[in-house]
């Protein structure tokens, strides 16, 4: 018979012959020939891989760092990673969470409009017209544009989201 | 890397001052955003007030209002809280922060105890 070009589900091509992946939670030995199935270990302590795969190495879990104010979440099995999450008051830096700050500033351009709390980290919003911020900060929020008209001035430069409008001198009419 | 120290912490009785300092080694100061927070012997942290890199923005919690004042002295690289009119449930290990807020750039705290 002809040699596969193409495997089933759950299965790979090598040598010319489909063999069958390994589980999650278990890592390739060895490949299986004419005669023998694929040969799959479980991982180790600590160890996990989470797809049916033909990996001859599982992947450490990760490693939840206290000295960056981690904890474990959810410990790891043979299947599954182990999820991370921050010490209470504490926000992650990213879906990863592979890191904790305290709260995280709202960029140049945006205003603050929450500060954060111990359950919910700073909640920014995009500066609307009329108002900027310039600054990164975790508590400040968009700052009007100054009123050039009010002193009696003149807008010699817009204002953005970012940075404030630049008053000037009216031009005085020569008679 | 940032080192943040924090001092002036102490025993006082109800309706007295105190000053916390909070010098930062290490590291650029002038220019960051800082932060005192305080956590109460079992409760959670709690953002106290907050002033600007340039000093001229603060920020209070309703619980301290006109009776707390945050300053800066870029020029010692030292940050400073000055509580006046204390009442019990100011007592806490107070911590200050600076930009960007990483958990491993914690200092140790200075506890502060009103009690008469």
């Known amino acids: 018979p002809e040699p596969p070009t193409a495997c089933r589900e759950k299965q790979y091509l090598i040598n010319s012959q489909c063999c069958s992946l390994c589980q999650p939670g278990q890592k390739l030995v060895s490949d299986c020939t004419e005669f023998t199935e694929t040969e799959c270990l479980p991982c180790g302590e600590s160890e996990f891989l989470d797809t049916w795969n033909r990996e001859t190495h599982c992947h450490q879990h990760k490693y939840c760092d206290p000295n960056l104010g981690l904890r474990v979440q959810q410990k790891g099995t043979s299947e599954t990673d182990t999820i991370c999450t921050c010490e209470e008051g504490w926000h992650c830096t990213s879906e990863a969470c592979e890191s904790c700050v305290l709260h995280r500033s709202c960029s140049p351009g945006f205003g603050v409009k929450q500060i954060a709390t111990g359950v919910s980290d700073t909640i920014c919003e995009p500066c609307p017209v009329g108002f900027f911020s310039n600054v990164s900060s975790a508590f400040e929020k968009c700052h009007p544009w100054t009123s050039c008209e009010t002193k009696d001035l003149v807008v010699q430069q817009a204002g953005t989201n970012k940075t404030d409008v630049v008053c000037g001198p009216q031009d005085r009419l020569r008679a | 890397e940032v080192q943040l120290l924090e001092s002036g912490g102490g025993l006082v009785q109800p309706g007295g001052s105190l000053r916390l300092s909070c010098a930062a080694s290490g590291s650029t100061f002038a220019g960051y955003e800082m932060w005192w927070v305080r956590q109460a012997p079992g409760k959670g942290l709690e953002r106290v007030s907050?002033?600007?890199?340039?000093?001229?923005?603060?920020y209070y919690a309703d619980s301290v209002k006109g009776r707390f004042s945050i300053s800066r002295d870029d020029s010692k690289n030292t940050l400073y809280l000055q509580m006046n009119s204390l009442r019990a449930e100011d007592t806490a290990v107070y911590y200050c922060?600076?930009?960007?807020?990483?958990?491993?750039?914690w200092g140790q705290g200075t506890l502060v105890t009103v009690s008469s």
């Open positions: 907050a002033i600007s890199g340039s000093g001229g923005s603060t």
């Open positions: 922060a600076k930009e960007p807020y990483s958990f491993d750039h």
